[in-house]
Amino acid sequence: MAVTACQGLGFVVSLIGIAGIIAATCMDQWSTQDLYNNPVTAVFNYQGLWRSCVRESSGFTECRGYFTLLGLPAMLQAVRALMIVGIVLGAIGLLVSIFALKCIRIGSMEDSAKANMTLTSGIMFIVSGLCAIAGVSVFANMLVTNFWMSTANMYTGMGGMVQTVQTRYTFGAALFVGWVAGGLTLIGGVMMCIACRGLAPEETNYKAVSYHASGHSVAYKPGGFKASTGFGSNTKNKKIYDGGARTEDEVQSYPSKHDYV
């Protein structure tokens, strides 16, 4: 039960995170006009990854797309790339994890296959989250650098007579959405990886110790084996996987090939 819950929760958290990454990527408010310590303007500027917008006090909003690729700063292109990679990986991860969900039965898919798919989706979610966090952080760093540069020469003018107020930009809502969404995707990925350990079938052969009593004998075997009576075929220490009889906690307590996570 704990594995199913962990996997399901990981899926849901990742789903919310990826939805957030998509939302952040599409949002126009990556950077917004800094209003603190600035003359109050009747025009509010904000920018996204794909277009820049101006909202007048009248309520009229005009947005213009960045219709050039070559003319854009390399950093902006890098942020775009990171966010898109994050979305693509996340989307593939979601697709894979749907089939990996323990509560969904698809044909006669073995638990080992589900474990592998869960691990794959978990890694994809982790990389997706990291891409989003990296993208947002690069953009934030770019903003901070530009902010202090524009603060240094905020008022530029001809002989001090005519002044031009430079528009300074600060963190927009999309950055916070991106950070939170990236974090959620990352957490969801980690949860999937943890769940994967519990889904993995046992592959380690445990040496059974047989105590031969006079007449009736019992072979005591660890949890992965069924105890059998007498000297029948089971005394050859065959590993029998009992998928339904074990508790989830028992499953997690045994080492498996997925222990490197």
Epitope: Q33, P39, V40, T41, A42, V43, N45, Q47, S52, C53, V54, E56, S57, S58, G59, F60, E62, R64, V162, Q163, T164, V165, Q166, T167
Partner: antibody
Framework: EIQLVESGGGLVRPGGSLKLSCAAS????????MSWVRQSPERRLEWVAE????????YYVDTVTGRFTISRDNAKNTLYLEMTSLRSEDTATYYC???????????WGQGTTLTVSS | DIVMTQSPSSLTVTAGEKVTMSCKSS????????????LTWYQQKPGQPPKLLIY???TRESGVPDRFTGSGSGTDFTLTISSVQAEDLAVYSC?????????FGAGTELELK
């Protein structure tokens, strides 16, 4: 046809109070930012105040801040300007105007006259 | 506050003449976000409220004759009337629509010879 009709002007003693009204028609009042502008007897125009669509954001010229209050009733399609602690320099014709593209004032009322005198 | 300086204060012209009037602001009214200048021109005839002529420094309001042209950027703006008509006799005011308070210029009065 878009119409803005101001009312409430008159003669007031210095230190007195008055409330101006502006009835709007011919457009979706609730969707527009509105302003008050005054014109002194010397014919100089002065922007007085502005109110956003929801009434939550208001802006004033320094000379009237704390004395004048701009408000609106979207249900009644009416704009108000409540004036207190009136001074002789507040004597002017008060116009209400609708804010359009470029924050310009695209429609104006005919104005109402306020005289502050003892 | 932004100071709007208009010149000349009055202008005497003859019908059919080309007229230009100036408006200067103490700070740039150019918004970097959309490269638009937030300056408006109004026309006010005696006994009437002001009428919007031009916004964004050069965009003519609908219904305004094309003899009225706005130009300029940053701090220096010009209103040009290509061929003055008798009905154009009025006071022309410019307004800063970028910084609060949204200040007006003192106006340029157009008179007939």
């Amino acid at each position: 046809e878009i119409q803005l009709v101001e009312s409430g002007g008159g003669l007031v003693r210095p230190g007195g109070s008055l409330k101006l009204s502006c009835a709007a028609s011919g457009f979706s009042f609730k969707n527009y930012v509105m302003s008050w502008v005054r014109q002194s007897p010397e014919r100089r125009l002065e922007w007085v105040a502005e109110i956003r669509t929801g009434g939550d954001y208001t802006y004033y010229v320094d000379t009237v801040t704390g004395r004048f209050t701009i408000s609106r009733d979207n249900a009644k399609n009416t704009l108000y300007l409540e004036m207190t602690s009136l001074r002789s320099e507040d004597t002017a014709t008060y116009y209400c105007a609708r804010v359009g593209y470029g924050n310009s004032l695209d429609y104006w009322g005919q104005g109402t006259t306020l005289t502050v005198s003892s | 506050d932004i100071v709007m300086t208009q010149s000349p204060s009055s202008l005497t012209v003859t019908a059919g003449e080309k007229v230009t009037m100036s408006c200067k602001s103490s700070q740039s009214l150019l918004n970097s976000g959309n490269q638009k200048n937030y300056l408006t021109w109004y026309q006010q005839k005696p006994g009437q409220p002001p009428k919007l002529l031009i916004y964004w420094a050069s965009t003519r309001e609908s219904g305004v004759p094309d003899r009225f042209t706005g130009s300029g950027s940053g701090t220096d703006f010009t209103l040009t009337i290509s061929s003055v008509q008798a009905e154009d006799l009025a006071v022309y005011s410019c307004q800063n629509n970028y910084f609060y308070p949204l200040t007006f210029g003192a106006g340029t009065e157009l008179e007939l010879k």
